[in-house]
C-alpha cells in the first residue's frame, strides 16, 4: 500500500499556503482527485509529488494515491481543507447526473471542518427540500440524496452557518434520468397496406420512451423520408409521431416502409409492405381439396381464404343441391380476419345427414365483382345388403343387392349348417365377384351393385351368405334354404344409423 506524507488523514491549511503531498510506493504511483486548479505533479520512480504554492478553497478535496501495478489495488488518501473564511464551500460540479433510484452525490465540500454542525441542503432561492427527500452529509464528499427520484431533478444549494448567518454555495443542478429499459417502443400502422392507384393513403410511425432523448424516422425502401415530427407526453412517456400522407398513390409509392427508433440502449425497427394495384381484386382459394368425401354422421369444416381489396361488400354460403332446398344455417358459418386484406370463411357441417351431400358454394362480392368457390361433398356409407332367390332363364339364382359408397365389393360364401353369419370353420366355398353389375351410380348418392350366384340345387342344410364391403365398413345377408322355399336372414345388428 502506498504511503502519503504528511501521514495524516486530514490537512487544514490557509489560502495561499504551499502544500506538498508526497506519495511513495513499491512501484510507480499515481495521484487521483477532483479536477482542481494550481496543482503540479513531479514523479521520480516510486514517488510522486503533488504540490501547489498557492492553495485556494478550490483545492479542498480528497486526494488518493494508488499503485497501478499492485494486484491488491491498495490506496492511501488524504483530505485537504483550505480554510477560507469567505468561502465555506468548494463546489466541484455544476451538474450531477444520475439514474432514478441511484444515490446522487452533490459534491459540496466544506472548506473548514468546524462548520460541519451547521450544514443543510436547500433548493435554490431558499426553498425547502421536497417531502420524502432522504439525504446525508459527509464533510469530505458533500450531500448525498439517497435513491433519487425523477421529481427531485432540481437546483440545489449547500448551506453553512458562519457567525450566525447562513452562507450558500453556488447551485448544483441535479438531473435524475429515468432508467431506460431498452430501445423505444414502436408502432407502425397499418401493418400492411393496399391501395388502388390514385387513392389516398396514410402510414403512421410512432415511438415512445420514458426518456425524451430518442430519435425516430420512417424510411421507404432504405430511403429516409423527411416528415415533420409531432411530439407529445402522456402516461409518463414521451411520444414522437411521423405521419406520411399520400393524396394520390402511384406505383413508385409501393414497397417496404420501416419505422426505426433509437436511443442510448439501442435500436428498434418494424416494417410493413405497401402494395399499389391497378384495380380492385378478389381472390378465393382453399387449402382443402374442392372434392370432399366424408363418412355419414361425421362432421366437416369447409374453409375458404379470401384475399380482397377493397373490402367485401357481401358474402354467403349456398347449398346447390341436389337433395333438398335447405340452406346452410348462418350460425354454422363464421368469418375470421387474418389481416386487413385476408379473411378465412368457415362453414361447419356437424353430423352430416344423407340429405346434406352435394355442392356448397361460397360467394363473395367487392367492387372488383363476384367470385365463387364450390365444394363437392360426397358422403361415404357402409354397404347395405339384401339377398333374394329367383329364377333367371330357368336357373335358380341368388340375387344380392349391395348399396353403399364407395362402391362395395361382393363376396359369396357357402357354409355348412344354418347360421346368421358364416364363420371360417363352417365355410365350404367362397366366390369373389370382381365385377358386380352397377345398378345405380349418381353423383352424391350411394352406388348400388348387384351380384348373381347361380345355384343348380340348394343344399338344405347349408347357408349362402352375400358379403359386401368398402372403405367405410361391411354388410352381409345370409340365405338359408328351407323345404317350403327359402329363408333369408339379415344380420342381427342394424348396421347403419345415420
Amino acid at each position: 500500500i502506498p504511503v502519503i506524507e504528511p501521514s495524516v488523514p486530514e490537512l487544514v491549511v490557509k489560502p495561499g499556503a504551499t502544500v506538498t503531498l508526497r506519495c511513495v510506493g513499491n512501484g510507480s504511483v499515481e495521484w487521483d482527485g477532483p479536477p482542481s486548479p494550481h496543482w503540479t505533479l513531479y514523479s521520480d520512480g516510486s514517488s510522486s509529488i503533488l504540490s501547489t504554492n498557492n492553495a485556494t478553497f478550490q483545492n479542498t478535496g480528497t486526494y488518493r494515491c494508488t499503485e497501478p501495478g499492485d494486484p491488491l489495488g491498495g490506496s492511501a488518501a488524504i483530505h485537504l481543507y483550505v480554510k477560507d473564511p469567505a468561502r465555506p464551500w468548494n463546489v466541484l460540479a455544476q451538474e450531477v447526473v444520475v439514474f432514478e433510484d441511484q444515490d446522487a452525490l452533490l459534491p459540496c465540500l466544506l472548506t473548514d471542518p468546524v462548520l460541519e454542525a451547521g450544514v443543510s441542503l436547500v433548493r435554490v432561492r431558499g426553498r425547502p427540500l421536497m417531502r420524502h427527500t432522504n439525504y446525508s452529509f459527509s464533510p469530505w464528499h458533500g450531500f448525498t440524496i439517497h435513491r433519487a427520484k425523477f421529481i427531485q431533478s432540481q437546483d440545489y444549494q449547500c448551506s453553512a452557518l458562519m457567525g450566525g448567518r447562513k452562507v450558500m454555495s453556488i447551485s448544483i443542478r441535479l438531473k435524475v434520468q429515468k432508467v431506460i429499459p431498452g430501445p423505444p417502443a414502436l408502432t407502425l400502422v397499418p401493418a400492411e397496406l393496399v391501395r388502388i392507384r390514385g387513392e389516398a393513403a396514410q402510414i403512421v410511425c410512432s415511438a415512445s420512451s420514458v426518456d425524451v432523448n430518442f430519435d425516430v424516422f420512417l424510411q421507404h425502401n432504405n430511403t429516409k423520408l423527411a416528415i415533420p415530427q409531432q411530439s407529445d407526453f402522456h402516461n409518463n412517456r414521451y411520444q414522437k409521431v411521423l405521419t406520411l400522407n399520400l393524396d394520390q398513390v402511384d406505383f413508385q409509392h409501393a414497397g417496404n416502409y420501416s419505422c426505426v427508433a433509437s436511443n442510448v440502449q439501442g435500436k428498434h425497427s418494424t416494417s410493413m409492405f405497401f402494395r399499389v394495384v391497378e384495380s380492385a381484386y378478389l381472390n378465393l382459394s382453399s387449402e382443402q381439396n374442392l372434392i370432399q368425401e366424408v363418412t355419414v354422421g361425421e362432421g366437416l369444416n369447409l374453409k375458404v381464404m379470401v384475399e380482397a381489396y377493397p373490402g367485401l361488400q357481401g358474402f354467403n354460403w349456398t347449398y346447390l343441391g341436389p337433395f333438398s332446398d335447405h340452406q346452410p344455417e348462418p350460425k354454422l358459418a363464421n368469418a375470421t380476419t387474418k389481416d386487413t386484406y385476408r379473411h378465412t370463411f368457415t362453414l361447419s357441417l356437424p353430423r352430416l345427414k344423407p340429405s346434406e351431400a352435394g355442392r356448397y358454394s361460397f360467394l363473395a362480392r367487392n367492387p372488383g365483382g363476384w367470385r365463387a368457390l364450390t365444394f363437392e361433398l360426397t358422403l361415404r356409407y357402409p354397404p347395405e345388403v339384401s339377398v333374394i332367390w329367383t329364377f333367371i332363364n330357368g336357373s335358380g339364382t341368388l340375387l344380392c343387392a349391395a348399396s353403399g359408397y364407395p362402391q362395395p365389393n361382393v363376396t359369396w360364401l357357402q357354409c355348412s349348417g344354418h347360421t346368421d353369419r358364416c364363420d371360417e370353420a363352417q365355410v365350404l366355398q367362397v366366390w369373389d365377384d370382381p365385377y358386380p353389375e352397377v345398378l345405380s351410380q349418381e353423383p352424391f348418392h350411394k352406388v348400388t351393385v348387384q351380384s348373381l350366384l347361380t345355384v343348380e340345387t340348394l343344399e338344405h342344410n347349408q347357408t349362402y351368405e352375400c358379403r359386401a364391403h368398402n372403405s367405410v365398413g361391411s354388410g352381409s345377408w345370409a340365405f338359408i334354404p328351407i323345404s317350403a322355399g327359402a329363408h333369408t336372414h339379415p344380420p342381427d345388428e342394424f348396421l347403419f344409423t345415420p
Epitope: 482527485g33 477532483p34 479536477p35 482542481s36 503540479t40 447526473v97 441511484q102 459534491p107
Partner: antibody, heavy 117, light 110 residues
Framework: QVQLQESGPGLVKPSETLSLTCTVS????????WSWIRQSPGRGLEWIGY???????KYNPSLMSRVTISADTSKNQFSLKLSSVTAADTAVYYC???????????WGQGTLVTVSS | QSVLTQPPSASGTPGQRVTISCSGS????????VNWYQQLPGTAPKLLIY???QRPSGVPDRFSGSKSGTSASLAISGLQSEDEADYYC???????????FGGGTKLTVL
C-alpha cells in the same frame, strides 16, 4: 493499457441532438475524470466538459445550456449529448481521461460529426 | 480565437533544436501547470509534457518543457522527420474553471 472508443452517428441534422458514447476499457471510469473535447478547423481544440465521481459534471460555460454528460458505470461508458446543434458544432469529437494536474493522458481516436440537413 | 497564443507554424532541419512558445495570462499559465500535446496527421492528440516539464513514459528526452510567468515553451532538440506534427499547449483556466488550449503550431521538418 487504458483505451477509449467514441461511437455515435456521424451526421446530425441542425436543431437536433448530437449523442456520442465513449466506451472505456483497461480502467474504471470510477477513478480520475473523463472529458469530451472537440476539434474544428475554425476553433482548434475546445474543452466541452468532464464527469467524475460517475455523475458530477462541469461544462464549458459557452456550451453549458446545451450540454449533458452522463456516465453508466455498469457499462464503463460515459456519454455526451449536445442539443440544438448548428453547423458550427461540426467537429471531430474526442473523449479523454483527465488527471490531477489537469492534463489528458489517454484519448479516443476521435469521431467526426457533421451537422447538415 | 484560442485563449492561449501559439505561433501558427515553426520549422527546422533534422538535428536542429526548435522551440515553440505559448503565451497566456495569470488566470491560466500564471497560476497553473502547462501541458503539451503532439498531434500527428490524422490521429488524436497525444500527451507530450505535463506539469510544465514532466515527460510521460515513452516520450523521448529530446522533448522538454518550461514555464516562466505567464508563458511556456516546448523545446525539441535533435529534430527528426517523425516530429512533423501539430503541437498544442494547454493549461487550467481559473476563470473558465476548466482547461484551455492554444491554437496549435504546425511544425515542419525541412
Amino acid at each position: 493499457q487504458v483505451q477509449l472508443q467514441e461511437s455515435g452517428p456521424g451526421l446530425v441534422k441542425p436543431s437536433e441532438t448530437l449523442s456520442l458514447t465513449c466506451t472505456v476499457s483497461g480502467g474504471s471510469i470510477s477513478s480520475f475524470y473523463w472529458s469530451w473535447i472537440r476539434q474544428s478547423p475554425g476553433r482548434g481544440l475546445e474543452w466541452i466538459g468532464y464527469i467524475f465521481y460517475s455523475g458530477s459534471t462541469k461544462y464549458n460555460p459557452s456550451l453549458m445550456s446545451r450540454v449533458t454528460i452522463s456516465a453508466d458505470t455498469s457499462k464503463n461508458q460515459f456519454s455526451l449529448k449536445l442539443s440544438s446543434v448548428t453547423a458550427a458544432d461540426t467537429a471531430v469529437y474526442y473523449c479523454a481521461r483527465g488527471r490531477l494536474g489537469n492534463y489528458f493522458d489517454y484519448w479516443g481516436q476521435g469521431t467526426l460529426v457533421t451537422v447538415s440537413s | 480565437q484560442s485563449v492561449l497564443t501559439q505561433p501558427p507554424s515553426a520549422s527546422g532541419t533534422p538535428g536542429q533544436r526548435v522551440t515553440i512558445s505559448c503565451s497566456g495570462s495569470s488566470s491560466n499559465i500564471g497560476n497553473n501547470a502547462v501541458n503539451w500535446y503532439q498531434q500527428l496527421p490524422g490521429t488524436a492528440p497525444k500527451l507530450l509534457i505535463y506539469s510544465n516539464n514532466q515527460r510521460p513514459s515513452g516520450v523521448p528526452d529530446r522533448f522538454s518543457g518550461s514555464k516562466s510567468g505567464t508563458s511556456a515553451s516546448l523545446a525539441i532538440s535533435g529534430l527528426q522527420s517523425e516530429d512533423e506534427a501539430d503541437y498544442y499547449c494547454a493549461a487550467w483556466d481559473d476563470s473558465l474553471n476548466g482547461p484551455v488550449f492554444g491554437g496549435g503550431t504546425k511544425l515542419t521538418v525541412l
